[in-house]
């Protein structure tokens, strides 16, 4: 008579986390008499998964009735699979012995792999802000998924992007995988309210993709435009000059007034007006006592935005001839003539 063989027909079984795994095992003979056991792993450290004879195995059920006469099917089902259940499962036949049963023959083993969901995608933007018309890179990372097949898409304000590069690691077979993608995005002035989205689809997600987002407000710097104008004044010996700082982002802004190159006043923007596109406006004014000046005055509005190099706009405030002759008696307003920026 042929010696008993332990047949584990599947070399590997793949199951999604949370599902049940069926591990198949069959004997070719009823002899020798003795129980079968299932183990995870081999050697002294192996874990007992199921013992036909005795024990408590709450997650394990047998596929067929083992006590039935002539039963040769010793397949089991393990419920509520988690990644920690991965490993090689061995169906082992024992020969009845005294005082202990003796291991007789083992199956070749069935590798249980667990289909695992990708982690929530983490999107990160550039370390430093860039100005409109420049290209910035965003990265998206997700880890721990299995199997390897995965789809990643990038969107900007709902529109799919095409300029990106994606890698899935490792290249060979593994228990789980990671994905890394870099998208290149050209900034526009209106991007303060824009968002980039990294979307990941995987078999374990059952059609409900994972999304990671990043706000372009963290990546963009819109430099201000400056306009210096003179406002009408009732008092003859005063000129009110305003500096309109427009369409800048982010908020951080410091403005310095200079009279003939000398610092007159420095202030930090506080009460800002927000535009629809997310940029800000701010206005600063300077009262100039014209009677204190015998000659024309060059007024400079100098703005330092978001730690960048200062930009400025200068205007020449012309002191009229009457003012130059009569000082405070002059009643004509000073004339304002623009000059090229310094």
């Amino acid at each position: 008579e042929d010696e008993l063989q332990v047949i584990q027909p599947e070399k590997s079984v793949s199951v999604a986390a949370g599902e049940s795994a069926t591990l198949r095992c069959a004997m070719t003979s009823l002899i020798p008499v003795g129980p079968i056991m299932w183990f995870r792993g081999a050697g002294a450290g192996r874990e007992l998964i199921y013992n036909q004879k005795e024990g408590h195995f709450p997650r394990v059920t047998t596929v067929s009735e083992l006590t039935k006469r002539n039963n040769l099917d010793f397949s089991i089902s393990i419920s509520n699979i988690t990644p920690a259940d991965a490993g090689t499962y061995y169906c082992v036949k024992f020969r009845k012995g005294s005082p202990d049963d003796v291991e007789f023959k083992s199956g070749a083993g069935t590798e249980l792999s667990v289909r695992a969901k990708p982690s929530a995608p983490v999107v990160s933007g550039p370390a430093v802000r860039a100005t409109p018309e420049h290209t910035v890179s965003f990265t998206c990372e997700s880890h721990g998924f299995s199997p390897r097949d995965i789809t990643l898409k990038w969107f900007k304000n709902g529109n799919e992007l095409s300029d990106f590069q994606t890698n899935v690691d490792p290249a060979g077979d593994s228990v789980s995988y990671s994905i890394h993608s870099t998208a290149r995005v050209v900034l526009t002035r209106g991007d303060v309210h824009s968002q980039v989205i990294c979307e990941i689809a995987h078999i374990t997600l059952q059609g409900d993709p994972l999304r990671g987002t990043a706000n372009l407000s963290e990546a963009i710097r819109v430099p201000p435009t400056l306009e210096v104008t003179q406002q009408p004044m009732r008092a003859e010996n005063q000129a009110n000059v305003t500096c309109q700082v427009s369409n800048f982002y982010p908020r951080g802004l410091q403005l310095t007034w200079l009279e003939n190159g000398n610092v007159s006043r420095t202030e930090t923007a506080s009460t800002l007006i927000e535009n629809k596109d997310g940029t800000y406006n701010w206005m600063s004014w300077l009262l100039v006592n014209t009677c204190a000046h015998r000659d024309d005055v060059v007024l400079t509005c100098q703005v330092e935005h978001d730690g960048q190099q200062a930009v400025s706009k200068s205007y020449a405030l012309e002191i009229s001839a009457h003012q130059k002759e009569h000082g405070s008696d002059i009643t004509h307003e000073a004339a304002l003539a623009p000059t090229a920026p310094l």
């Epitope: 002294a44 450290g45 192996r46 408590h56 593994s174």
Partner: antibody, heavy 118, light 114 residues
Framework: QVQLVESGGGVVQPGRSLRLSCVAS????????MHWVRQAPGKGLEWVAV????????DHVDSVKGRFTISRDNSKNTLYLQMNSLRAEDTAVYYC???????????WGQGTLVTVSS | DIVLTQSPDSLAVSLGERATINCKSS????????????LAWYQQKPGQPPKLLIY???IRESGVPDRFSGSGSGTDFTLTISSLQAEDVAVYYC??????????FGQGTKVEIK
């Protein structure tokens, strides 16, 4: 939840014996291989011994073979390490660890300190 | 026996920055029959026992924050902490379970805050 509580450590002279115990709870003790791992003061981890789920098979690191014996009592959910002929180099914190399959160690006890000194 | 060598022995990283620990094995721990890498990573905080972080080289243990990730195959492996937090200060060990007994560990890498 899984808990492993070691006891039996202390100060002992070279050549003497000590028996460590580890009481397990929160899992079916009799289904798992169990291990002892030690850590000398300021040093790394060193695996010491393993015992099978039923206590019938065991193995030890070469440096303790013939001196240390791992055993278990499944009726008491307890793992033991009998340490004989102790040496100064056996001074360490001894951890009891639950095996996950024949693979990695998924739970560890807090450890018990054994000091071998004259 | 399989020897695991970690590098660096210690590293100081600023909060929020990435920390990378390498583990090199003297022989492969990749089982070609099932394409599994038999490697785990543990974290040991001062005065505490080791805690399992990663197994099968890349699977995060339940409850481990996803800033921890494992990668690599064959003989070269990496543990990455993507954004270091104050509570991540610890010694990290790799361990092989491919060729056992004995189960062997790397010498450990100490991670501190810069």
């Amino acid at each position: 939840q899984v808990q492993l509580v070691e006891s039996g450590g202390g100060v002992v002279q070279p050549g003497r014996s000590l028996r460590l115990s580890c009481v397990a709870s929160g899992f079916i003790f009799s289904n798992y291989g169990m291990h002892w791992v030690r850590q000398a003061p300021g040093k790394g981890l060193e695996w010491v011994a393993v015992i099978s789920y039923d206590g019938r098979n065991e193995d030890h690191v070469d440096s303790v073979k013939g001196r240390f014996t791992i055993s278990r009592d499944n009726s008491k959910n307890t793992l033991y390490l009998q340490m004989n002929s102790l040496r100064a180099e056996d001074t360490a914190v001894y951890y009891c660890a639950k095996g996950s399959g024949s693979y990695y160690f998924d739970y560890w006890g807090q450890g018990t300190l054994v000091t071998v000194s004259s | 026996d399989i020897v695991l060598t970690q590098s660096p022995d210690s590293l100081a990283v600023s909060l929020g920055e990435r920390a990378t620990i390498n583990c090199k094995s003297s022989q492969t721990v990749l089982n070609s029959s099932n394409n599994k890498n038999y490697l785990a990573w543990y974290q040991q905080k001062p005065g505490q026992p080791p805690k399992l972080l990663i197994y099968w080289a890349s699977i995060r243990e339940s409850g481990v924050p996803d800033r921890f990730s494992g990668s690599g195959s064959g003989t070269d492996f990496t543990l990455t902490i993507s954004s270091l937090q104050a509570e991540d200060v610890a010694v990290y060990y790799c361990q092989q379970y491919y060729n056992t007994p004995p189960w062997t560990f790397g010498q450990g890498t100490k991670v501190e805050i810069k």
